[in-house]
């Protein structure tokens, strides 16, 4: 789970060790603040749960790619 260290900065201290199906993911955000110990991805699931993930892992990169493409494709 992400931790808010103050009103403006959310950090991840641990990453999920389970791959999450892309169908369960709604969105993501990048954590890049130097106030945090590591850069991270926070995925938001379709049930609004937030999960910290390691941006170095291929499944995380693939999921970000999928979500970015999905976001830009107009839904018909």
């Amino acid at each position: 789970q992400p931790d808010a260290i103050n009103a403006a900065v959310t950090c991840c201290y641990n990453f999920t060790n389970r791959k999450i199906s892309v169908q369960r993911l709604a969105s993501y955000r990048r954590i890049t603040s130097s106030k945090c110990p590591k850069e991270a991805v926070i995925f938001k699931t379709i049930v609004a749960k937030e999960i910290c993930a390691d941006p170095k892992q291929k499944w995380v990169q693939d999921s970000m790619d999928h979500l970015d493409k999905q976001t830009q494709t107009p839904k018909t």
Epitope: S34, K38, D68
Partner: antibody, heavy 117, light 107 residues
């Protein structure tokens, strides 16, 4: 706070090699990627490559493949970039930068490398 | 490589002006672009990354927009400290590439 401190300016002869260092403080380099970007005098920015210090996995612009070596020492939080077979067109400011997503949140101060006979 | 074409290469503006810099990618980069500011003799400074993420400490007069292949950096009211060179960069796929830069000069 995060700081990247690079080694000093170098003057090199054509055909020789140069090795530039970048020491990080305020972060654990194994948690990020360390990149190298160069800028020729009066020109734009050019990404050369990056290393994942955690597993030493590297990725390069094909333009530099075979001529550039990027290494990292996690025990000293230092990344290195070595460029071989130098030519006059390699005269540039070389920057190290940090970022796992492919953009660069923190930069070193730059190292000027002059290639001249 | 994904080529990034930035325009204009230079512009003259006055304090208080609204300034717009554009960047065109040669293929879709899905909002994976960053904008940097560079002053003479200094390293670039990250301003914006992704769709709208303003870096911590960057004034709100800077904003980014766009999608697909076309992106814009806007400075809503130019300040004296904004005179510099600005670069766009795509981080959709390696090798990561930069635009040629836009030099913002005092009119």
């Amino acid at each position: 706070q995060v700081q990247l401190v690079q080694s000093g300016a170098e003057v090199k002869k054509p055909g020789s090699s140069v090795k530039v260092s970048c020491k990080a403080s305020g972060l654990t380099i194994s948690h990020t990627y360390m990149h190298w970007v160069r800028q020729a005098p009066g020109q734009g920015l050019e990404w050369m490559g990056r290393i994942d210090p955690e597993n030493h996995n590297t990725k390069f612009d094909p333009k530099f493949q075979g001529r550039v070596t990027i290494t990292a020492d996690t025990s000293t939080s230092t990344a290195y970039m070595e460029l071989s077979s130098l030519r006059s067109e390699d005269t540039a400011v070389y920057y190290c930068a940090r970022g796992v997503f492919g953009f660069f949140e923190h930069w070193g101060q730059g190292t000027t490398v002059t290639v001249s006979s | 490589d994904i080529q990034m074409t930035q325009s204009p290469s230079s512009l003259s503006a006055s304090v208080g002006d609204r300034v717009t810099i554009t960047c065109k990618a040669f293929e879709d980069i899905y909002n994976r672009r960053a904008w940097y500011q560079q002053k003479p003799g200094k390293a670039p400074k990250l301003l914006i990354h992704g769709a709208t993420s303003l870096e911590h400490g960057v004034p709100s007069r800077f904003s980014g927009s766009g999608s697909g292949t076309d992106y814009t950096l806007t400075i809503s009211s130019l300040q004296p400290e904004d005179f510099a060179t600005y670069y766009c960069q795509q981080f959709w796929s390696a090798p990561y590439t930069f635009g040629g830069g836009t030099k913002v000069e005092i009119k």
